[in-house]
Amino acid sequence: KAMHVAQPAVVLANSRGIASFVCEYASPGKATEVRVTVLRQADSQVTEVCAATYMMGNELTFLDDSICTGTSSGNQVNLTIQGLRAMDTGLYICKVELMYPPPYYMGIGNGTQIYVIDPEPCPDSD
Amino acid sequence: KAMHVAQPAVVLANSRGIASFVCEYASPGKATEVRVTVLRQADSQVTEVCAATYMMGNELTFLDDSICTGTSSGNQVNLTIQGLRAMDTGLYICKVELMYPPPYYMGIGNGTQIYVIDPEPCPDSD
């Protein structure tokens, strides 16, 4: 009955602080409404990074002020997190909920370790 | 005879392509001459990155054209690898050999996964 969620073990943010990864879930049923949440786990503390609910076949829309963007294709969600700094390095967990129709299912990935390196500032132009 | 060698699991190179890590070995005897080798494992291929032999209490000297530098303190070697690019991301293994006096011991660490992100080029100054 458990829903399997797969995500990569490690991802590197690029030098602009953008990290992308795919979250894939094995849907036990024909879900039409899906909610995807990205959680960050540091020590034993878990916090929400962003979340979006979408109708299957439609676009994934995060809130305007969200640091996440994403697209969906079948049972795959392509997630992008931006504005990352070195201090944001950590484990990012993908949580998927099949909200409708019944039954409800929840699946949690093992997490993607995102590494972020702050860039060196460019020299001032004289 | 086997000798235990410890090294961190993961290290991030900084934005200038420099990565540092400590390689620590549990010396079974009173070695006076030690050789440290850094190996890179990609797929199943292992290549030598750099190597240095040093006398206990003396400085660690790599060849002039080596991309490695290091210092030693007791049974710890502080290794720095420079000039790294994103394509150099991989598993870097620390190998320690106690060359003298007998008996000879060799120890190999589990490897340090070094992640390297290429920086964005700075904009041209007009």
Epitope: A2, M3, E33, T37, P103, Y104, Y105, M106, I108 | -
Partner: antibody, heavy 118, light 108 residues
């Protein structure tokens, strides 16, 4: 700190209605799904109903389906349970519970007792 | 519906002893979706373990969880006086959310 406070319990006759409330504080209420769980005197825990973040999705235990309605007002940080056509077997302590980020019920209210008796 | 069966119904032990509580599911439950709760008389349940083996915030390390598939265990390594209570397992991976019938840990 996180707090859930239930109210609205009491003694009611079979066939009548009752509305329970759960006031939430100390967290962003709209970011969490919520549940009602009940416990009959001397018995174990029984899940009753669930509501999604925005209140659009609701699930019920078979034992209360068609009689109970869960709702939420995110602007008031309050969860509700409307109980109609009450039966003697609905007698229980009713707890509201928050779903933690990873799924378990991480915070519970102190409970409110509903007694259905003629 | 996933039915959870706990055993034993009652466990009579002395402080300092080790308690082993079992929870068996009627079908496979992902270990990420199994929790344990503690309930004392007159109190609400309290989350102890989630994801089969992760301790909730503030829970002492004498409590540990293990298992996968259909068989899960809660272990209390050395019973303290405050540990005598009723313990429930729960699955939360799919609706309907279900609880075991509980195991009472009482003082011998």
């Amino acid at each position: 700190q996180v707090q859930l406070v239930e109210s609205g319990g009491g003694v009611v006759q079979p066939g009548r209605s009752l509305r329970l409330s759960c006031a939430a504080s100390g967290f962003t209420f709209s970011s969490y799904t919520m549940h009602w769980v009940r416990q009959a005197p001397g018995k174990g825990l029984e899940w009753v109903t669930f509501i999604s973040y925005d209140g659009n999705n609701k699930y019920y235990a078979d034992s209360v389906k068609g009689r109970f309605t869960i709702s939420r007002d995110n602007s008031k940080n309050t969860l509700y349970l409307q109980m109609n056509s009450l039966r003697a077997e609905d007698t229980a302590i009713y707890y509201c519970a928050r779903t933690g980020w990873l799924g378990p019920f991480d915070y519970w209210g102190q409970g409110t007792l509903v007694t259905v008796s003629s | 519906e996933i039915v959870l069966t706990q055993s034993p119904g009652t466990l009579s032990l002395s402080p300092g002893e080790r308690a082993t509580l079992s929870c068996r599911a009627s079908q496979s439950v992902g270990s990420s979706y199994l929790a344990w709760y503690q309930q004392k008389p007159g109190q609400a349940p309290r989350l102890l373990i989630y994801g089969a083996f992760s301790r909730a915030t503030g829970i002492p390390d004498r409590f540990s969880g293990s298992g996968s598939g259909t068989d899960f265990t809660l272990t209390i390594s050395r019973l303290e006086p405050e540990d005598f209570a009723v313990y429930y397992c729960q699955q939360y991976g799919s609706s309907p959310w279900t609880f075991g019938q509980g195991t009472k840990v009482e003082i011998k």
